[in-house]
């Protein structure tokens, strides 16, 4: 079998809301993946599991099941959303993200994603990690591919 390539394209949108009383930040982060099937037969994308970390703490998880199938030598673009919560012991971040003296409130998040594909009963997992800047002070949307090179650094695959 030939490879199945997973490419993390970047953040498609980041929508922020706050709970003032609880000093909590809610960030809904939608990411984009390109999955390429280099085989001459179809493969199923069985699931995508994703998590987001801030300062080595997991702040959000998501799982998508029975997503799609990808035809021979085809590529599909898949968006997935991870709801994240920055709260409790990290509530000091609420002060930063709502600071009224500045307009830009960048934080660095680590995006982790694992794609599970199946073909002929065989299962394969491909993982990616990427550090990304997100502005926790406002909503942000991107045109396709606009955020492709936003990584702070790319860890070894």
């Amino acid at each position: 079998p030939r490879s199945i390539d997973v490419k993390y394209i970047g953040v498609k949108s980041a929508y922020v809301s706050y709970d003032v009383q609880k000093r909590t930040i809610y960030l809904n982060i939608t990411n984009t993946l390109n999955i390429t099937n280099n085989n001459y037969y179809s493969v199923e994308v069985e699931n995508i599991t994703a998590q987001v970390q801030f300062a080595k703490t997991v702040i959000g998880k998501a799982r998508l099941n029975n997503i799609t199938h990808i035809g021979p030598l085809d590529m599909k673009q898949i968006d997935y959303t991870v709801p994240t919560v920055i709260a409790e012991e990290m509530s000091y971040m609420y002060d930063f993200c709502t600071l009224i003296s500045i307009k830009v409130h960048n934080i660095v998040l680590m995006m982790q994603v694992t794609v599970t594909t199946t073909y002929f009963g065989h299962s394969e997992q491909i993982s990616q990690e990427r550090y990304q800047y997100v502005d926790c002070g406002r909503n942000t949307t991107y045109q396709l591919g606009q955020s492709e090179y936003l990584n702070v650094l790319q860890p070894q695959q």
């Epitope: 500045i102 830009v104 406002r138 942000t140």
Partner: antibody, heavy 118, light 113 residues
Framework: EVQLQQSGPVLVKPGPSVKISCMAS????????IHWVKQSHGKSLEWIGL????????NYNQNFKGKATLTVDTSSRTAYMELNSLTSEDSAVYYC???????????WGQGTLVTVSE | DIVMTQSPSSLSVSVGEKVTVSCKSS????????????LAWYQQKPGQPPKLLIY???TRESGVPDRFTGSGSGTDFTLTISSVQAEDLAVYYC?????????FGAGTKLELK
Amino acid sequence: EVQLQQSGPVLVKPGPSVKISCMASVFTFNDYYIHWVKQSHGKSLEWIGLVYPYNGGTNYNQNFKGKATLTVDTSSRTAYMELNSLTSEDSAVYYCARSYFSNPIGYWGQGTLVTVSE
Amino acid sequence: DIVMTQSPSSLSVSVGEKVTVSCKSSQSLLNSGNQKNYLAWYQQKPGQPPKLLIYGASTRESGVPDRFTGSGSGTDFTLTISSVQAEDLAVYYCQNDHSYPLTFGAGTKLELK
């Protein structure tokens, strides 16, 4: 429908001060920054500053420090701007507006015309 | 403070015409972290408050017709109206949404030929 209801037009003499108001309805007052913007007749827009109703925190344009004072009364869901040492240069339409925290200013009041004249 | 320079100051147009308004900032409005440009465009009709059209340099506010397009990066930005309608006659302002104090361009007045 979201509303920022501003007080009516005022005609004042040069010298003391004037206080104009902006009452919020249909949205959570504490969840938004309230901005004040000046528009002199036929001119562009000048950002005066903002106030955060939740804690009364303010951020002023240095050009308006000492000229404008921004306050809020959360019980009546009203933001206020007081202009002091009035001169004819202060004659303008003053808008209050809101933004969801650091998002762009998305909604504006109808404006209050302040005329400073003898 | 960031100075916003708009051109032209006024524009005479016919209905159906394509229009471009230019805006230059004295400092970059790019958030180098997330690669978004923090520039907004507002439309103001006579006797009315400004209305947000575009934010993040290129994202249309909900309900804004798709004939309005924002583009540009860093210090150079453009608002394009692909086919001007009678209801588009107004003054258009660009605004620095990157740092305080928020600053506006002098405006571009769209008039009917």
